[in-house]
């Protein structure tokens, strides 16, 4: 098995992943692993000399960089907050704060606002991934309602009013539940069922 | 995944100057070297001139203080700026970039450069 440093007329190395093209010795030389930089590149009779990131700094890859790159916080401004360290290996991981989502992407999300309000009536539209777009806002399905503009509450279902021993008064809509009352009060004079001949 | 292409290859008349361009798209973010190498027919690939993702530049012995590599990271694109061209430089034109701080090493279709009176 050849290993670092080692001659390359074709400009390929044997491992994509773990090591570089040195293009004016002509040679393949080790890249520094996640976590890591390099201290010392190498040369025809040695190898790349790799150090450990200090402390608020990370290289997330395999890679041959003369730096570690300085530690990121969550841009508190931007609507952003964090849900993991920052690390030797991995830069801070960011989410938009609950109630946002994310409004601008350059490989991670940079700056986000606050999630439209859903009307009476409908509800936001569940996505897989919190945080990843705007509500999308959809009717209540039969027989459920939603009564507030809201952007994070959920189509309830219709109270059933046999359930608690009562009886209809009001069928239920998208905006508003059912109303119920008691099976001896009596209905109100344009609500009952009388004829007068 | 990343692609690039070349452009700005052609005829010339010794003496001339070309431009090449060199524009990188798709999945293209990170930290890059790139390179400008040639091949004439019947030759290996040599390298012409280097730009490090730190800023320097380097060159081939036989291209210095004619050729001049610069790069657009805004644009994602290298050029190689080909003055006081000579016969010997005929060859097909390749531009080359490697990730520094991931994995990863791309090369162009090539365009042929022909000087010729």
């Known amino acids: 098995q050849v290993v670092p440093p080692y001659g390359s007329e074709n400009q390929t190395c044997r491992d994509q992943e773990k090591e570089y093209y040195e293009p004016r010795h002509r040679i393949c030389c080790s890249r520094c692993p996640p976590g890591t930089y390099v201290s010392a590149k190498c040369s025809r009779s040695r190898d790349t000399v790799c150090a450990t990131c200090a402390e608020n700094s990370y290289n997330e890859h395999w890679n041959y960089l003369t730096i570690c790159q300085l530690c990121r916080p969550c841009d508190p401004v931007m609507g952003l907050e964090e849900i993991a360290p920052c690390t030797s290996k991995r830069k801070t991981q960011c989410r938009c704060q609950p109630g946002m989502f994310c409004a601008a992407w350059a490989l991670e999300c940079t700056h986000c606002e606050l999630l439209s309000d859903c009307p009476p009536g409908t509800e936001a539209e569940l996505k897989d991934e919190v945080g990843k777009g705007n509500n999308h806002c959809v009717p209540c399905k039969a027989g459920h309602f939603q009564n507030t503009s809201s952007p994070s509450a959920r189509c309830q279902p219709h109270t059933r009013c046999e359930d608690q021993g009562l009886v209809e008064a009001a069928p239920g809509t998208a905006q508003s539940d059912t109303t119920c009352r008691n099976p001896s009060e009596s209905l109100p004079p344009e609500m009952s069922g009388t004829m007068l001949m | 995944d990343v692609q690039l292409v070349e452009s700005g290859g052609g005829l010339v008349q010794p003496g001339g100057s070309l431009r090449l361009s060199c524009a990188a798209s798709g999945r293209f973010f990170g930290i890059y070297d790139m390179y400008w190498y040639r091949q004439a027919p019947g030759k290996q690939r040599e390298l012409v001139a280097i730009?490090?993702?730190?800023?320097?530049?380097n060159y081939a012995d036989s291209v210095k203080g004619r050729f001049t590599i610069s790069r657009d990271n805004a644009k994602n694109t290298v050029y190689l700026q080909m003055n006081s061209l000579r016969p010997e430089d005929t060859a097909v034109y390749y531009c080359?970039?490697?990730?520094?701080?991931?994995?990863?090493?791309?090369w162009g279709q090539g365009t042929l450069v022909t000087v010729s009176s």
């Open positions: 730009s490090t993702s730190g800023g320097h530049t």
């Open positions: 080359n970039i490697q990730r520094v701080d991931a994995p990863g090493f791309y």
